[in-house]
């Protein structure tokens, strides 16, 4: 028998600095978790102490705090070659800057393999960037040959920027060739490992042929056997196991996401490679593990171009952008109409001739906006500005609900209306009309929606039984400020980019803002 | 300015043991995994064998696996080549070189030192 | 016998374009990428191109490389007298576990 220890990350999500409980910023250090610097102690603590292990990333490196607006990805190819990541999936996220800036700062830099299989690239981009993503590679680990092939969600050309110069295929159909291959190559270990959430994670278990372990990402799946450490709660055991269509036990694991946990799967392997036993947990990355220091010099190195960049100019407002809660919470206000803006045009993406774009709607909790801008300070907004107004390091994700659950919302939106509570819904493609005078439940008597599947945009009435796509804070998609309704009925959740970072560039992009009150939120004659 | 020094080469004879060693200097040497890499007189290059940065990964050859032994110390920037019973075939000048990465098995050598010359004769 | 396989010799005068064909199979070039390494006489190697088109630092763009299936090829336009030497092909093999190499082209410019 063989043993192999796997070590993984997903969805670290440019936290490379430690982070609070909840993965917002570190405000009390002695309490804070993840980042880097604690993540090398671990796993070098680990690779001291066991033979073979591999240590392995299954994509979303970026995106999500300005470590990533300012660096671009530099960040994420010097910190994994730092910790001397033996490969790593792509993911969605990593399409954020479009391919250029995929290739440039991680691709060409990365020291590590970095792997899809389900990736084609076609036309100029094939011999620009071939080489530099694999479907596959080998790896020697002790005596032995492990093989990694890689997957991507193909669901990437609605989430990020991948351009029309990449195909994604079905993960499944795309797999099983590349593990024949490594069959052939006789390579009797093979790790799957991709960006494509649990669900299908379990499907590549089930279905590809040859796989014997399954390290997945994407949905920030969180599985524990026992007690759970902290504040997440466990979707099933570590590892899930899945048994195949040929009737093998397939483990899939995930490591729930930012870097709080360290993935850790012990695989007992027989000399046919065949599965013999799997067991382990993610480990926390809590403060009982130290900061490497020289990993923590570097990072104090590199953080002093973000404390610079977090007071240059992004661009201009003339008009006050109205963040105040006795706006953002009673009625329609501008910065709400700013941030939906925002959040719509970070998700253009023409990918389907019948559309002129896939998504057209935005809905934003008030509560969630916590500053004006005074446009009395020469109009300047910088990246310090919108963290007030956006303190919380969200996210602005994609989910389809369908129209009765989106009714169900905008009844929740005003169910206590007056009260200064943050449910109340700020939107972008919606007109929507309340009357107050009606009981808790029916009070929307108007709703209204932009379409998708037209060449020249208007607003339609919401269909109840239609599935419709819509931009939300992760907060509301996850339940917060009791929409639970959201979170209980939607069919499909991407996650998506940092808040602030949606809003820095589409200012940065328009240069010159002077978002109005423009009556997307009414309320009926009489009642208000 | 980057650097890489071969030395213990010279004559010896078959069956016989060598080391070969190599100092390394103008990088962070344990950023880099390391590999021998031989060119028998008038022939191509042969790849020897590689060590990962931590020297938890290793590979050799076919033709030097049981004999040669590779080694490294990271405190000491210096990379070895322990070369036992030697043969005749073993003949050629033996460069150390860097690879582009910290795994051996990727990235390719991006930086070649001089070489030594290693002849194994009676 | 190398398991690359490169044509012994090339030639061409300068100004001109000349290719340089490297040959391999699945295990190698059809999973792994290409390196090419230029030697000059008298000279230990240098690297010329890394995964497959990708040149270091101080290489002229003269020198491009290209891979297709399990072919790899190195091109060199506008010739110049300097760039008489041997070059090499190399690829990671997963079926041998280690690294291999073409036996070599010697380039003459006349």
């Known amino acids: 028998a063989w043993e192999l220890t796997i070590l993984h990350t997903n969805d670290v999500h440019s936290r490379l600095e430690q982070t609070s409980e909840d993965s917002s910023k570190c405000v009390n250090a002695s309490r804070c978790m993840g980042g880097v610097a604690r993540l090398f102690t671990k796993v070098q603590q680990i690779r001291r102490a066991e033979p073979n292990v591999l240590l392995l990333d299954a994509g979303d490196q970026y995106q999500g705090t300005i470590w990533f607006t300012v660096y671009k990805g530099a960040e994420v190819a010097h910190f994994m070659n730092a910790l001397r990541y033996d490969a790593m999936a792509l993911g969605n996220h990593e399409f954020d800057n479009g391919v250029e800036g995929l290739i440039e700062p991680l691709l060409k830099e990365a020291k590590f393999p970095i792997l899809s299989a389900n990736i084609k690239a076609k036309g100029p981009l094939a011999s620009q960037i071939s080489g530099l993503y694999l479907p596959y590679k080998v790896l020697p680990v002790g005596d032995e040959v492990v093989g990694i092939v890689g997957y991507t969600s193909k669901e990437t050309p609605f989430l990020s920027n991948p351009g029309t110069n990449l195909v994604f295929e079905d993960e499944i159909t795309a797999l099983q060739p590349e593990v024949d291959k490594l069959k052939t190559l006789n390579v009797n270990k093979i790790i799957a490992l991709g960006h494509s959430g649990f669900e299908m994670d379990k499907l590549i278990a089930q279905k590809v042929r040859g796989v014997d372990v399954v390290v997945g990402g994407h949905s920030n799946t969180f599985l524990y056997t026992g007690n759970p450490p902290s504040k997440e709660v466990p979707a099933g055991k570590y590892p899930f196991i899945v048994t195949s269509d040929d009737g093998r036990k397939v483990p899939v694991v995930q490591a729930y996401a930012f870097g709080k946990y360290l993935g850790y799967l012990k695989i007992e392997f027989d000399e046919r490679g065949n599965v013999i036993s799997s067991h382990g947990n993610p480990i926390l990355l809590n403060s009982s593990i130290p900061e490497d220091p020289s990993i923590k010099a570097d990072i104090n190195k590199w953080r002093i171009k973000l404390d610079n960049y977090s007071t240059q100019e992004l661009g201009k407002t003339i008009v006050y952008l109205d963040g105040s809660s006795q706006s953002c919470r009673f009625r329609e206000c501008n910065m709400g109409n700013l941030i939906c803006d925002a959040m719509i045009n970070n998700n253009l993406r023409h990918t389907d001739e019948m559309f002129w774009n896939h998504v057209s709607m935005c809905i934003l909790n008030g509560g969630g906006i916590r500053s004006p801008i005074d446009e009395r300070n020469n109009g300047t907004i910088t990246w310090e500005n919108l963290a007030a107004v956006l303190p919380f390091g969200g996210t602005f994700d994609l989910v389809q609900l369908k129209g009765s659950t989106l009714k169900k919302a905008f009844e929740h939106s005003v169910h206590r209306y007056g009260q200064s509570t943050g449910e109340f819904l700020q939107v972008g493609g919606i007109h929507v009309v309340y009357d107050l005078s009606r009981k808790p439940g029916d009070r929307v008597v108007k709703l209204d929606v932009l379409c998708t599947k037209c060449r020249v945009p208007s607003y339609d009435p919401l269909k109840m039984d239609e599935v419709y796509k819509v931009i939300l804070p992760n907060f509301l998609a996850n339940g917060g400020d009791g929409f639970q309704m959201i979170k209980d009925e939607l069919l499909r959740h991407d996650s998506g980019d940092q808040d602030i970072n949606v809003v820095s560039t589409y200012i940065s992009k328009m240069k010159v803002i002077y978002p109005a009150v423009e009556g997307r939120i009414k309320f009926s004659t009489g009642s208000h | 300015e980057v650097q890489l020094v071969e030395s213990g080469g010279g004559l010896v004879q078959p069956g016989r043991s060598l080391r070969l060693s190599c100092a390394a200097s103008g990088f962070t040497f344990d950023d880099y995994a390391m590999h021998w890499v031989r060119q028998a007189p008038g022939k191509g290059l042969e790849w020897v064998s590689g060590i990962s940065w931590n020297s938890g990964s290793i590979g050799y050859a076919d033709s030097v696996k049981g004999r040669f032994t590779i080694s490294r110390d990271n405190a000491k920037n210096s990379l070895y080549l322990q070369m036992n019973s030697l043969r005749a075939e073993d003949t050629a000048l033996y460069y150390c070189?860097?690879?582009?990465?910290?795994?051996?098995?990727?990235?390719?050598?991006?930086?070649w030192g001089q070489g030594t010359t290693v002849t194994v004769s009676r | 016998q190398s398991v690359l396989t490169q044509p012994p010799s090339a030639s061409g005068t300068p100004g001109q374009r000349v290719t340089i064909s490297c040959s391999g199979s699945s295990s190698n070039i059809g999973s792994n990428t290409v390196n090419w390494y230029q030697q000059l006489p008298g000279t230990a190697p240098k690297l010329l191109i890394y995964s497959n088109n990708q040149r270091p630092s101080g290489v002229p763009d003269r020198f491009s490389g290209s891979k297709s299936g399990t072919s790899a090829s190195l091109a060199i336009s506008g010739l110049q007298s300097e760039d008489e030497a041997d070059y090499y092909c190399?690829?990671?093999?997963?079926?041998?576990?280690?690294?291999?190499f073409g036996g070599g082209t010697k380039l003459t410019v006349l």
């Open positions: 190399a690829a990671w093999d997963d079926s041998l576990n280690g690294w291999v």
């Open positions: 070189v860097r690879s582009g990465s910290y795994n051996y098995y990727y990235y390719g050598m991006d930086v």
